[in-house]
């Protein structure tokens, strides 16, 4: 070994080395929450940059760069460090046009933290162990959330657009010149039937148990789905969409409620299999993947 | 295509009866309202009754007590006429808001028209 790669061993060795890095890590992520940070701290941005390119060149020095097996750029933790660095010269030296949208991986320079601190590494790596487990456990999720948003798109495609309308139109009027002229809240409101303090029309459907529309109103399927066009079955993203929100119990049982109203509580049973099937039993598989990973990883 | 074919129409003296029918031809999802109008020569077209599937019906005030509107299980809607007068000549039309699939939305079709004649 040269001297030169003996004293970086020594000093990337050494524990006083490990404290500096984690103190500048640390005192670069107080900087890095200033909202208007004062003009002297660019010097200080330099510091940093200069620490964290010495803390490189040190072990870059020590391990080699990359042609051994344990040379800098084999542990991943290091592609961290070296992205860092390359971006802060990138920010500062190259004029590349939007610079706010790199200045954003700074922000990685927090990650930094993980690798110096040893518990830390160990989680995040347990944690890493874990989405590689999960693989199986998310195709099969995707593909049951998939089959199900299927079967929701054959039953459900349209039905949420049902609303319930006024009777009363005028001699000349047809539902497609209303809908052409409707155009605030206001407007709607004076044609659709609302419930207080309700953003959408009243749901309703066509078969004899799903939600009937009050005296004077008539059940049409036209204009929007409700939530401002967001819930709905009418295709299969948004299908997947709705199954998802069900499986991670988002506000279900109002997404329940508006389908079951426009479709019939005869579908009830569509959700109740959806909720054992997605919410109680793959939520519960994704945790137990996890929670073995972890397990595994503390041994 | 979705059509709508009245039918019924004719003279008729005064005091007389007529029966008008309008069936949907085609195919047809849903059938929401089922509505009567009538132009009269030289002026607008009014409304003169509706059904609806819940059963709500309701009639212009100048045929209320005469005419009466009803619809069977198929895609039919009748119009039953009763003691008419000359002022009820007019051209009368069929108007359905329906559903031709249960993938289209809501919309509103005409019939052709039925000519009631009211004289002596």
């Known amino acids: 070994f040269s001297p030169l790669r003996r004293i970086s061993i020594k000093i990337l060795v050494h524990s006083l080395f490990s404290m500096l890095i984690m103190c500048t890590i640390l005192t670069n992520c107080i900087f890095m929450t200033m909202n208007n940070p004062p003009d002297w701290t660019k010097n200080v941005e330099y510091t940093f940059t200069g620490i964290y390119t010495f803390e490189s060149l040190v072990k870059i020095l020590a391990r080699g760069f990359c042609v051994g097996e344990f040379t800098f750029l084999r542990d991943p933790w290091n592609w961290l460090d070296f992205v860092v660095i390359v971006f802060a010269y990138l920010t500062e030296f190259v004029n590349l046009g939007n610079v706010s949208a790199l200045r954003t991986f700074r922000v990685l320079r927090a990650l930094k933290t993980i690798s110096v601190i040893p518990g830390l590494k160990t989680i995040v790596g347990a944690l890493i162990q874990s989405v590689k487990k999960l693989s199986d456990v998310m195709i099969l999720t995707v593909f049951c959330l998939s089959v199900f948003a299927l079967i929701g798109l054959q039953l459900f495609m349209g039905n949420l657009k049902h609303k319930c309308f006024r009777n009363s139109l005028e001699n000349n009027e047809t539902l497609e010149s209303i809908m052409n002229t409707l155009e605030s809240e206001e407007d709607f409101r004076k044609y659709f039937y609302y419930l207080e303090g309700s953003k959408d029309a009243l749901l309703c459907g066509f078969s004899t148990d799903s939600g009937q529309c009050p005296e004077g109103y008539t059940c049409v399927k036209i204009g929007r789905n409700p939530d401002y066009g967001y819930t709905s079955f009418d295709t299969f993203s948004w299908a997947f969409l709705a199954l998802f929100r069900l499986m991670t119990q988002d506000y279900w049982e109002n997404l329940y409620q508006q389908t079951l109203r426009a479709a019939g509580k005869t579908y009830m049973i569509f959700f109740v299999v959806v909720i054992f099937l997605g919410s109680f039993y793959l939520i519960n598989l994704i945790l137990a993947v996890v929670a073995m990973a972890y397990e595994e990883q503390n041994q | 295509e979705v059509q709508l074919v009245e039918s019924g129409g004719g003279v008729v003296q005064p005091g007389g009866s007529l029966r008008l029918s309008c069936a949907a031809s085609?195919?047809?999802?849903?059938?929401?309202?089922m509505a009567w109008y009538r132009q009269a020569p030289g002026k607008q077209r009014e409304l003169v009754a509706y059904?609806?599937?819940?059963?709500?019906i309701s009639y212009a005030d100048s045929v209320k007590g005469r005419f009466t509107i009803s619809r069977d299980r198929s895609k039919r809607v009748y119009l039953q006429m009763n003691s008419l007068r000359p002022e009820d000549t007019a051209l009368y039309y069929c108007?359905?808001?329906?559903?031709?699939?249960?993938?289209?939305?809501?919309?509103?079709?005409w019939g052709q028209g039925t000519l009631v004649t009211v004289s002596s």
């Open positions: 085609g195919p047809v999802f849903n059938i929401n309202r």
């Open positions: 108007r359905a808001l329906l559903q031709p699939d249960r993938y289209s939305n809501t919309r509103t079709y």
């Open positions: 059904v609806t599937p819940t059963g709500d």
